[in-house]
Every structure is written in C-alpha cells, then in structure tokens.
Interface confidence: medium
Amino acid sequence: KFSKQSWGLENEALIVRCPRQGKPSYTVDWYYSQTNKSIPTQERNRVFASGQLLKFLPAAVADSGIYTCIVRSPTFNRTGYANVTIYKKQSDCNVPDYLMYSTVSGSEKNSKIYCPTIDLYNWTAPLEWFKNCQALQGSRYRAHKSFLVIDNVMTEDAGDYTCKFIHNENGANYSVTATRSFTVKDEQGFSLFPVIGAPAQNEIKEVEIGKNANLTCSACFGKGTQFLAAVLWQLNGTKITDFGEPRIQQEEGQNQSFSNGLACLDMVLRIADVKEEDLLLQYDCLALNLHGLRRHTVRLSRKNPIDHHS
C-alpha cells in the first residue's frame, strides 16, 4: 500500500518522494532495501537523502532497486517503499510504455499538459516541450509555468509530449525529461445542415467594369471535424472548372473555426477585368455536406463611377 513506483533515465536527475507523509520536522531515514544500507545525507554523494526526498544526481542503471524510507516522529514510525527503476536512454525517438507517466485528456476548452513530477525539482523556466520527439514550434504552443497550453486543440494534437528541464543542486545542473500521452476529447462535435454566412441570398454586388472583383462564399457546417464539407461557386449552374472562363477562378479562403467552435469554410471567387457579359451571369454560392445543399445566388450590377466636378 505504501509503495510507489519511480523511474528515470540514466545520466538524468531523479528525485523520489517517500510514499509516507509526515511533518517537515519529522526525520526521514532512507535505506537501500537489498542491503539494508543507510543512504547518506551528505550532498557530495551522487545518491543522497534529503528529508522526504531521495536524490539521484545523476541516476545510473545500477541504482535500480527498492528503497525504504522510515518517517520517525516522537510517537510513531511509518515505513514506505520506493521501487526505483533506471533505464538506459533509448537510441531512437520511441518512448516505451514503461517510461510514460499518466495519460491526460484535453479538449478545445482545456488543453493543459502538466509536466510530471516537476514539483520535486529545483528548476527555472522555461520548460522545453517536444511532441513525438519534435520540438514544439508555433504560436499555438505556450510553455506556461509547469505546463504546456495548446491553443485551438485539434485531434492531430494527440500524441506523446515530453517536457525537458534543468534541475539545479548547489550550482550543478542536471537534465530531466518526462513523457506523457495526451488525448483529445471530442467535445460533442456535431454536423448540421450548412449555414451560409455570406453572401446574403439574392445579394446584388456592385462591380466596376474593367476592374477586378472578389466574391466570398462562407458557410458553417457544425462543430468539430466534418466529413465531406464543401463550399464552391457555380456560374449559371455550371462548376467554375467546367465553365471555361480563365478570368473567373475560385480559390480556397481561410478555414475558420470560430471561438464558439463552429467549423466553417470559405471559397473566394475572383473575377479579373470585369466585363459587361459578367453582369448577365448568375453566381451561386453552394455549401454542401452529408445533410444537404444550400445555395445563395448573387448577381453583379455596374457601379457607376462618381463624377468629379471641378
């Protein structure tokens, strides 16, 4: 019951807390169980006891074994056991299961990944974070105190996250790494009949002959990841690609995931060098998913240039 598993990598710092708790004023004695040999408290030793903490600075594979801690008070003694395993460093990126700390789950609203065991160490910010052995880069990732925050969490963010920090002991620095899996909970994603946000139905768009014009078709499809969501433009009921007018092209706009979690798509229709005949066409913004198709129609009208009188 009062036994705790601890593990670490060779040549890294490992600090283990006695599984039996006591007041700071209580003395704690540590022993190597196999030999019943007392662990020294002098900090010049590579392995030494410091109250409730047992420190391996740094750890070696040979340190593996069961350590006994006895918490002594004036009225009682409490005994705990720390089962310590020190592993050789892996040559490849793969982190084996036995080196993994507990899995944490995150979601769009809560995406904190705490660095395991870090509170036992004397460390200073910043923490370094890696996912599947790759250093995390980009504004979505923020190392904050002892945890990592991921903005706009996606299912792709699931994986193994490793935190790396430096433990300082009397001016000497020791590296520590800890890895845990992160899973992403789908916060009740759903799919709904497409909702076109722009353009408005039967909108009239004013354009200038000879100038360029852009029309944006924007639609939302639900929350979370969507299967088969599409936004496209048609001209007179024909796909742009089949219409055969090189001046008129569609290109993807921004994927959007609004703060309320809605999944939306944009498609921009670009008309170069607007001509009179473009005013005669019917422009349809189509949004489609598994539930159905929604269509908003736009027509172009000539914008009269403003007369500038002297």
Epitope: E156, T225, Q226, F227, L228, A229, A230, V231, L232, K239, T241, E251, E252, N255, A263, L265, D266, M267, L286, L288, N289, L290, H291, G292, L293
Partner: antibody, heavy 126, light 106 residues
C-alpha cells in the same frame, strides 16, 4: 485521364513514422476530396481518413486519431498521409481514393470512391 | 459507426453462372451503398454507386438493388474476369466497408 499515383513501398521499425504520398492528375485537384483506405494482408478495406484539398480539412477514423496526419500540397497536387508510432498491425497496403458525389442530389450522402491509387505497401517489422 | 456485413464470405461459381451477393447495414442507410471489385494485388474498382447506379465503363451484367438495410449485387452471367473479391460500402456517414465476398472458380 484521372490518375492517382502513390509513392513506393516502405519498410519501417515499430515506433517509427511513415509518410505516403498520392499525386493527382487529370482533374482539378481542389475540387475533389481524397480519402485514405488501408488493407492488411488478406483482410478487408478499412477507412483511415479524408482530406479536403480545398482548405486542407481533415477527418480521421477514431481508431487512428492522434497517430495519423493528412496534409496536401496544392502546388504539386499531392496529398500525404503520415502515420506515427507504427506497430506491426499497421502492416498494410495504403490506398488513396478520390471521393465523388452528385451535387444535383443536393447532399453529400451517396458519395463514392471513383478513382484509386495503385497502393503503397507499408511493412512494420523489427 | 454503421457496421456492414456481407454474405456469403466466399462462393465458388462457374463461368455463365448467375451470382448474388448480399450486404446488410446495422441501420437504415436509404440507398447510400456502393459496390467495389478487387482483384489480387490491385486497387478496388467502383462498380455500383447509390445502390443501383452503374459506374460508366462497367459491364451491364453487374447490377445492384436494395434500400434501407438490405442490398444485393448481382452478376447475371459470370465471366472469367469477374473472379475477384467484392466489397460493399455505406456512404450515409463516414465510410465503412463490408468484410468482402470472394468469388472463385468452381
């Protein structure tokens, strides 16, 4: 004519990652979504996920979430499927397949995979 | 997820035989069902979409029927090139395939 050409066979060790490519030609790349389907030796077909070249949207089968990443490069009309933390049971032929649907029906239901890549054998072995 | 089952899992037939393969869905999928043919070492090939629509270039001896939960693929007169494995796939939601039916020579 429409073609989906996949990258060559790969042999990987457990725990490694693999990235398979699928180059599309003969049609407008951004118009059709691309799916990935895998087939273990002697087994049936298993859907892995979908990517929309127009916008890069992805949806993955629950089984692969957290291990699969699909991306696309519109400049080369190529989609990629990367699978990480490989295990022996990931040994399979991985196919890319174009998804089509009749917009006249007014919905995406009724989609079908009309063109397939030739397949890429990924072998995971220690 | 919608689960798909197929029967039989394999069958032996002769050239000229009429062959019927059935596919069942665990929920009503209307007519959103496709059929594919796969030969050893090759990619699947679309035969039928939306339960009964024949893909262009596919011989008319192939036909599909059914709606709701029960579907059938029929080969009216089996040809030598038809010996293969056949898969059904629902397209009502994210795709799931049946386990396949292998048609081999008797």
């Amino acid at each position: 004519q429409v073609q989906l050409v996949q990258s060559g066979a790969e042999v990987k060790k457990p725990g490694a990652s693999v990235k398979v490519s699928c180059k599309a030609s003969g049609y407008t790349f951004s118009t059709y979504d691309i799916n990935w389907v895998r087939q273990a030796p002697g087994q049936g077909l298993e859907w892995v996920g979908i990517i929309s070249p127009s916008g890069g949207w992805t949806t993955y089968a629950q089984k692969f979430q957290g291990r699969v990443t699909m991306t696309r490069d519109t400049s080369t009309s190529t989609v990629y499927m990367e699978l990480s933390s490989l295990r022996s049971e990931d040994t399979a032929v991985y196919y890319c397949a174009r998804v089509n649907y009749d917009i006249l029906t007014g919905q995406g239901r009724g989609y079908y995979f009309d063109y397939w890549g030739q397949g890429t054998l990924v072998t995971v072995s220690s | 997820d919608i689960q798909m089952t197929q029967s039989p899992s394999s069958l032996s037939a002769s050239v000229g035989d009429r062959v019927t393969i059935t596919c069942q869905a665990t929920q009503d999928i209307a007519d959103y069902l496709n059929w594919y043919q796969q030969k050893p070492g090759k990619a699947p090939k679309l035969l039928i979409y939306k339960a009964s629509s024949l893909e262009s270039g596919v011989p008319s001896r192939f036909s599909g029927s059914g709606s709701g939960t029960d579907f059938t693929l029929t080969i009216s007169s089996l040809q030598p090139e038809d010996f293969a494995t056949y898969y059904c796939q629902q397209s009502y939601s994210t795709p799931t395939f049946g386990p396949g039916t292998k048609v081999d020579i008797k």
